[in-house]
């Protein structure tokens, strides 16, 4: 009785269970009752990452420098190339097909998380007691200067964009 289902790492073809090709190899010819499945290794620029019956290997991803991409991990016969973005850029999507410059955090906002090749800068508003007076992709909110520790007094209050202005204490005679 011909099989209707096959074991793991097998496939059903013309009432016959054949072994799938292992990762890194493509199918050349189905098995027969007498012959094992014929598989061939993928060429240097190609890969297959699963047990398969593909007759063509997939091309490795190309990390196009014109799109700001560079190779993070070279592909093998079993894995695709992993691209990342050049310094100052990050991927536009999870598949990292192109790059855009990191955004800067505007005055009044500080960097919560510095951008990587795959994620953009995360900004946060400077809370009371902190400020940022620059547009930056690296700088966090800085604390207001503590006038007291310098034996000074606050002459002008700080904001989320400006530091406090300290001045000498008025000495009453």
């Amino acid at each position: 009785e011909p099989p209707t289902a096959c074991r793991e790492k097998q496939y059903l073809i013309n009432s016959q269970c054949c072994s799938l090709c292992q990762p890194g190899q493509k199918l050349v010819s189905d098995c027969t009752e007498f012959t094992e499945t014929e598989c061939l290794p993928c060429s240097e620029s190609e890969f297959l990452d699963t047990w398969n019956r593909e007759t063509r290997c997939h091309q490795h991803k190309y990390c196009d420098p014109n799109l700001g991409l560079q190779v993070q991990q070279k592909g093998t016969s079993e894995t695709d190339t992993i691209c990342t973005c050049e310094e100052g850029l990050h991927c536009t999507s999870e598949s990292c097909e192109s790059c855009v410059p990191h955004r800067s955090c505007l005055p009044g906002f500080g960097v919560k998380q510095i951008a990587t090749g795959v994620s953009d800068t995360i900004c946060e508003p400077c809370p009371v007691g902190f400020f940022s007076n620059v547009s930056s992709a690296f700088e966090k909110c800085r604390p207001w200067t503590s006038c007291e520790t310098k034996d000074l007094v606050v002459q002008q209050a700080g904001t989320n964009k400006t530091d406090v202005v300290c001045g000498p204490q008025d000495r009453q005679r």
């Epitope: 013309n14 010819s29 189905d30 027969t32 009752e33 007498f34 012959t35 014929e38």
Partner: antibody, heavy 117, light 109 residues
Amino acid sequence: QVQLVESGGGVVQPGRSLRLSCAASGFTFGSYGMHWVRQAPGKGLEWVAVISYEGVKKYYADSVKGRFTISRDNSKNTLYLQMNSLRAEDTAVYYCARDTSRGHDIWGQGTMVTVSS
Amino acid sequence: EIVLTQSPGTLSLSPGERATLSCRASQSVSYDYLAWYQQKPGQAPRLLIYGASARANGIPDRFSGSGSGTDFTLTISRLEPEDFAVYYCQQYADYPPFTFGGGTKVEIK
């Protein structure tokens, strides 16, 4: 390159025995089933026998069943056909051929067996 | 046993002409497991077509196979001098035995 080379043919008297060999090279012999096919002088092709890649399954044409035995030695990359009780009608060129789901894709050049008294 | 009948027995044609060879099976050939072979005098057969219509590696595209079930055809669109030979069909779906047709000889007219 992929190649099959038969040997062992010759002239033999009726009732006697002969063993044919088929040496394989250029491919993973132990992964393929193998066939013997023969061709009598001036006639068409006749399938004789098949053996599975590991030597477990064997099938024969009715005309040779009980007289011929197909076997293989994967360590030597060689296929065999033991022919006993030979008859005049076994006179033919004997070819070995590789089994695939695409048919017999590789053939040897053949070896001539003549059964004559 | 599947019996394969090839026709015609001999085909006399000139180079450049189209050749149409027929192979008829006594019962349906499962999965179209039918192959065509070419054999020249003193040589081993050579696989041309498998699965009724797929060309084997290195076979020129003037050779084509068609058909399914019980009726199969090998067509040579424009005969070249090297195409004059004997052609055999073979079924490899239902065995034993693997059966061959009786052959068609394509000769120069």
